[in-house]
Interface confidence: medium
């Protein structure tokens, strides 16, 4: 049997001649050269040689754990005389010892970290690492520990972890922004001999809002005309703020002062200034100064440096308003008025009025622009502002009027303002309803009582509030004696029914009917509307064969009450297309 | 016989939405103009708006507390009234009435009515 | 707008009294003045249209008279079917209704 154990070598060796590794031995081998000793697998013949007599092992080269820490390989022990072999082949391993020849290296050259100013101690910051290739389970050769050469006071590292966390208390950044921090790796524990390695790391101290704005300056003073409308800027004010970005940020608002509802500040987000504008019309005759307290706050506030003092600062802005002479200001800025249509000349409408709101106060006079009144359908009393009619109104003529009142000052006539005036005309029920259309109708001879031959609708240019309803009878002087009645809906349409039976064109070949319409509004207007009703020979469908001559050349045509139409230039037997009159033989 | 029917009436959040219809039938429903009314419980009764009829250009009108909110449109082909009432509010509950506008701007035939509770 | 002020807000009478209501405009409304009668539970029924026009089928005991901004409802004879609540309504310009006069049994 072969006899020998696992085989050492330590790498890296460094003598002159081959390295001896160990020796194969077969108990078979009774030294008389009879056998002979073959070597196989990774680096035989090569990296490793053997004495084929004597079975010692060397190695022809310097090893390198890191490299490749362990070599398997194959022993076989021959008869020489018959080449057989006297021992099963078997395997074999060489392991390469290691010794501590590589240093620790960090996974990065240089870190950058960043961590937040007036953290507290302890803060972790950034981790960093470092690996060394010796081997971690024989020795301290691969045991590192870390340890800072730069950057004392204010960073510590973990000698085991490579943590690297804040030393020292109250770093601002406003004083000191950057710092570069050495950081040695060592191996073997950190003992003397040990290998070492160093990496850089660049932390940078990040904002965080520990500073208020601050005005440099505790008042401010700035002057704006009277005339400046809503929304012009008057003056800017900066507040610093020695923090950045949005710590940095500011807002203004007005706090106090009389000027409170008259001006706004805003803020400029790019310049980071506040920008005193005008919120509402000024008066130099009502205030000629305002004095405001302007405040300058930070909105993103940090709650644990609330302990340093509130976080805003206020300054006292000065407005002077400037004196320009205005025109005359009405009370409002339009007036709707309205008036009856059937208002009598001189009618009061109703009053305009005007007031220069300089101090002096000059009286105004007031007047119509005729451009929006050409017909001078109204009038002002040029001292009181009074509206009132020179014209009859109508309504269905014009429902609204709109004219221009001008107020001018007396002492100033260069100084004038105007002023629509909406005048709306109020529906009074002053006309009749009439009929919707011309109508002219026929009835058959054979026509039977209590037949519907016409539908009525009417119109009325009055437009009453909850819309038009209107009732139909025959006039009272043709109610009794009329051979045709009126129907009533009671939907605004009424239909013209035969009376009797059968009607005689050779004893009256036209009928007219005298319809009253009434429009049941207040006060009542009515009409009386003539319906020609012809009376016609008719087949036993209903259709019209001869009728008078009149009603053959008329324009507009006859109606059966569906709409149907006469053409004068139709042939007398398809003179109707339309619905057919009911026929009862 | 003349005849006013509401529905849609039920419980609905602050600010949420609801319509109601009323349905006519015994008389020319398109000649004529109607109107809206509401009575809070235990309350009077408060005109909330009208449409005028197709001859009268489907005009409407609303009363102040609604106006933006409410809009009353109308279907002659069925017959039928609408009040789409949006951005409920709680003092919007009440019973609401359709009634039929009739000469001298009184109404001569009202609906049953149905009641709109606004509430949280 | 036209406000409307009925009075009394309420009254107790017996079967067979007169009754009178009174309703007072803002303003002028020519005579565009109606009248109305509600049950619990019911909707407003048409009495008066025009200030003094009845309304077909209102029993003739009940009218109304006035012009201008005053106007007034009478029942000549109560019944046990008039105890209600009644409403004046203007109609001259959009509408708006009284407060109304609940009448009771006494």
């Known amino acids: 049997s072969w006899m020998w154990n696992q085989f050492f070598l330590l790498e890296e060796y460094t003598g002159s001649d081959y390295q001896y590794v160990g020796k194969l031995h077969s108990d078979q081998d009774r030294g008389d050269g009879s056998l002979k000793y073959i070597l196989s697998g990774d680096g035989a013949g090569d990296l490793f040689i053997i004495n084929e007599n004597t079975g010692d092992i060397q190695a022809t080269k310097r090893l390198d754990r890191e490299e490749k820490p362990v070599y398997i390989l194959r022993a076989q022990a021959v008869n020489r005389r018959t080449g057989r072999p006297v021992e099963p082949e078997s395997e074999f391993i060489i392991k390469i010892h290691d010794i501590n020849d590589n240093e620790p290296i960090f996974t990065k050259d240089v870190y950058t970290a960043t961590v937040p100013e007036m953290a507290d101690v302890g803060t972790f910051v950034v981790q960093v690492t470092a690996t060394d290739a010796d081997d971690p389970t024989y020795g301290n050769s691969a045991k590192v520990v870390y340890s800072i050469l730069q950057g004392q006071p204010y960073f510590s590292v973990e000698s085991e972890t490579g943590i690297i966390k804040t030393a020292l208390l109250n770093m601002d950044r406003e004083n000191r922004e950057q710092y570069q921090v050495v950081i040695q790796a060592k191996d073997m524990g950190g003992q003397m001999g040990g290998l070492s390695g160093t990496t850089t790391v660049n932390i940078t101290l990040t904002d965080v809002n520990d500073n208020p704005p601050r005005f440099p300056q505790s008042t401010y003073q700035f002057k704006t005309p009277e005339s400046s409308p809503p929304g012009t800027p008057i003056g800017r004010i900066k507040a610093s703020d020695a923090d950045v970005g949005e710590n940095a940020e500011i807002e203004y608002s007005i706090t106090d002062g009389e000027g409170h509802e008259m001006f706004d500040v805003i803020t400029d987000q790019e310049t980071q200034e506040g920008i005193i504008t005008v919120k509402k019309l000024l008066d130099f005759e009502k205030k000629k100064v305002y004095t405001l307290k302007v405040e300058a706050s930070n909105p993103h506030v940090e709650p644990r440096f609330l302990y340093l003092g509130p976080f805003k600062d206020s300054a006292t802005v000065r407005i002077v308003v400037d004196d320009v002479d205005e025109p005359p200001v009405f009370s409002k800025l339009a007036y709707i008025l309205q008036i009856r249509e059937d208002a009598r000349i001189n009618t009061t409408i109703g009053s305009v009025a005007a007031q220069d709101p300089d101090a002096a106060r000059n009286p105004v006079k007031y007047s119509v622009d005729r451009h929006t009144d050409m017909d001078r359908i109204f009038n002002i009393d040029s001292g009181n502002g009074s509206i009132f009619t020179s014209k009859l109104l109508d309504r269905e003529t014009l429902l609204w009027h709109n004219i221009t009142v001008i107020a001018t000052e007396i002492n100033n006539p260069k100084q004038s303002s105007r002023v629509p005036l909406y005048i709306k005309v109020l529906d009074v029920n002053d006309n009749a309803p009439e009929f919707a259309e011309f109508y002219e109708t026929f009835v058959c001879e054979k026509a039977k009582a209590d037949q519907l031959i016409q539908t009525l609708r009417a119109v009325d240019k009055d437009d009453p509030y909850s819309g038009h309803q209107f009732s139909f009878s025959l006039a009272p002087e043709a109610a009794s004696s009329s051979n045709f009645t009126i129907q009533d809906n009671k939907d605004n349409t009424a239909g013209i029914l035969t009376r009797k039976n059968g009607y005689n064109r050779h004893e009256m070949s036209t009928y007219l009917l005298p319809v009253v319409i009434s429009d049941n509004d207040y006060p009542v207007q009515s009409s009386t509307g003539t319906v020609t009703v012809r009376v016609c020979a008719c087949d036993h469908h209903g259709n019209m064969q001869s009728c008078h001559a009149e009603a053959l050349i008329h324009p507009t045509g006859l109606s059966t009450g569906a709409g149907s139409e006469f053409r004068h230039d139709s042939g007398l037997n398809d003179i109707f297309e339309a619905q057919k009159i009911e026929w009862h033989e | 016989q003349v005849q006013l029917v509401e529905s849609g009436g039920g419980l609905v959040k602050p600010g949420g939405s609801l319509r109601l219809s009323c349905a006519a039938s015994g008389f020319t429903f398109s000649s004529y103009a109607i109107s809206w009314v509401r009575q809070a419980p235990g309350k009077g009764l408060e005109w909330v708006g009208f449409?005028?009829?197709?001859?009268?250009?489907?005009?409407?009108n609303y009363a102040a507390p609604v106006k933006g909110r409410f809009t009353i449109s109308r279907d002659d082909s069925k017959n039928t009234l609408y009040l789409q009432m949006n951005s409920l509010k709680t003092e919007d509950t009440a019973v609401y009435y359709c009634?039929?506008?009739?000469?001298?701007?009184?109404?001569?035939?009202w609906g049953q009515g149905t009641l709109v509770t606004v509430s949280s | 707008d036209i406000q409307m002020t009925q009075s009394p807000s309420s009254l107790s009478a017996s079967v067979g009294d007169r009754v009178t209501i009174t309703c007072r405009a803002s303003?002028?409304?020519?005579?565009?003045l109606n009248w109305y009668q509600q049950k619990p539970g019911k909707a407003p029924k048409l009495l008066i249209y025009?200030?003094?026009n009845l309304q077909s089928g209102v029993p003739s005991r009940f009218s109304g008279s006035g012009s201008g901004t005053d106007f007034t409802l009478t029942i000549s004879s109560l019944q046990p079917e008039d105890f209600a609540t009644y409403y004046c309504q203007q109609g001259d310009s959009s509408w708006t209704f009284g407060q109304g006069t609940k009448v009771e049994i006494k």
């Open positions: 009634a039929r506008i009739r000469y001298f701007r009184n109404w001569d035939y």
């Open positions: 449409i005028k009829s197709n001859a009268d250009g489907y005009t409407t």
């Open positions: 025009r200030a003094s």
């Open positions: 303003q002028t409304i020519n005579s565009y």
